[in-house]
Amino acid sequence: APFDDDDKIVGGYNCEENSVPYQVSLNSGYHFCGGSLINEQWVVSAGHCYKSRIQVRLGEHNIEVLEGNEQFINAAKIIRHPQYDRKTLNNDIMLIKLSSRAVINARVSTISLPTAPPATGTKCLISGWGNTASSGADYPDELQCLDAPVLSQAKCEASYPGKITSNMFCVGFLEGGKDSCQGDSGGPVVCNGQLQGVVSWGDGCAQKNKPGVYTKVYNYVKWIKNTIAANS
């Protein structure tokens, strides 16, 4: 298969240990999605990652080994966006309130919400414990990272005619080979220190002319702030 020579995230690299301190793993007996810590008690993830019971795991690097920096906190509230659409994956965003506050330290810290929409060409960091194979499956134990640019909305819409809403944007490489994949959902896309995207969907992974599609967090800043205020 074409892209198997460099198979991390797909086509990424092993993150330096705890270098993505806002990255969380959502666990229901096993890792199933990622997420981002946005304050001591709240996590942003994808709407399609909804489950009635979730344990949030912070400070993780190797999800199969207890390394000493982890904080495991159960979800107290799980709030999917009211307009989430399962079929189109529009409004694919969710908030999780932790049952206790996370202890903020060098290995567990928050990521800022965006103050402006993502600009075309901006280099972003995508991370997660998702599949590292574009064909087949190879799930890593250690957190994977990928540096990838924001694509123009025109290129995004051309890649997925009729499927891209104003709440979505594309990040990645039209030549294929580098992308997020299954198991990365809900995880962060951070550009210039701000959480611009949430891993959402795509046609396969790392396929030519089929970049990853991400929830545009900027469009939900007001909803996030209002929801946190109403549930504090």
Partner: antibody, heavy 128, light 108 residues
Amino acid sequence: QVQLVQSGAEVKKPGASVKVSCKASGYTFEGHYMHWVRQAPGQGLEWMGAINPYSGQTNYAQKFQGRVTMTRDTSISTAYMELSRLRSDDTAVYYCARDFVLLLRQSRILHESAFDIWGQGTTVTVSS
Amino acid sequence: EIVMTQSPATLSVSPGERATLSCRASQSVGSNLAWYQQKPGQAPRLLIYGASTRATGIPARFSGSGSGTEFTLTISSLQSEDFAVYYCQQFHNWPPLTFGGGTKVEIK
């Protein structure tokens, strides 16, 4: 309804090749991996490989690398498995099976795969 | 390659009794595990996926549990139609996809 219909039984001589077809109906053919599994008489299930009908990408078990070729014709929703240089121990029932995980507009949650639809099986006998 | 080991190879059970089948993976497969039932002359049939989720149309007497390396298929009260061979299969890391060697459930 969703089904996979395979071609009929084959009798081949050692050294020959066999090509088994698997016609899909009732779903979007390009949207799901198609796998091939074989079962020798009285034995267990053995995975041979898979094809992504959307991209054409293939993955083969090491054991069959160089002898197996998996292809597809999306215009007629059919997958093919060709096995060359046949030996007597290739005598088996060959199955195609659909992975139920959707490949298109696929959310990136950790998907739990499984073969939800199987073909009826094609018996291939290799005998001199 | 992840090796899947099923035990026992044969299980003799009386109708109405409980049957417990085991499947062990040589390394963690998370919850990426499926169970199939196969009767003579038939293609396998999906019973359980995601280690514990019953497939469409599968009776509630079939249940799956476990994650990581240890998995169990339980048939709470065996019916005559349940006597068959059962296979586990991992999807966590492939190629290759690997099956266990099977457990034959026979009438005692």
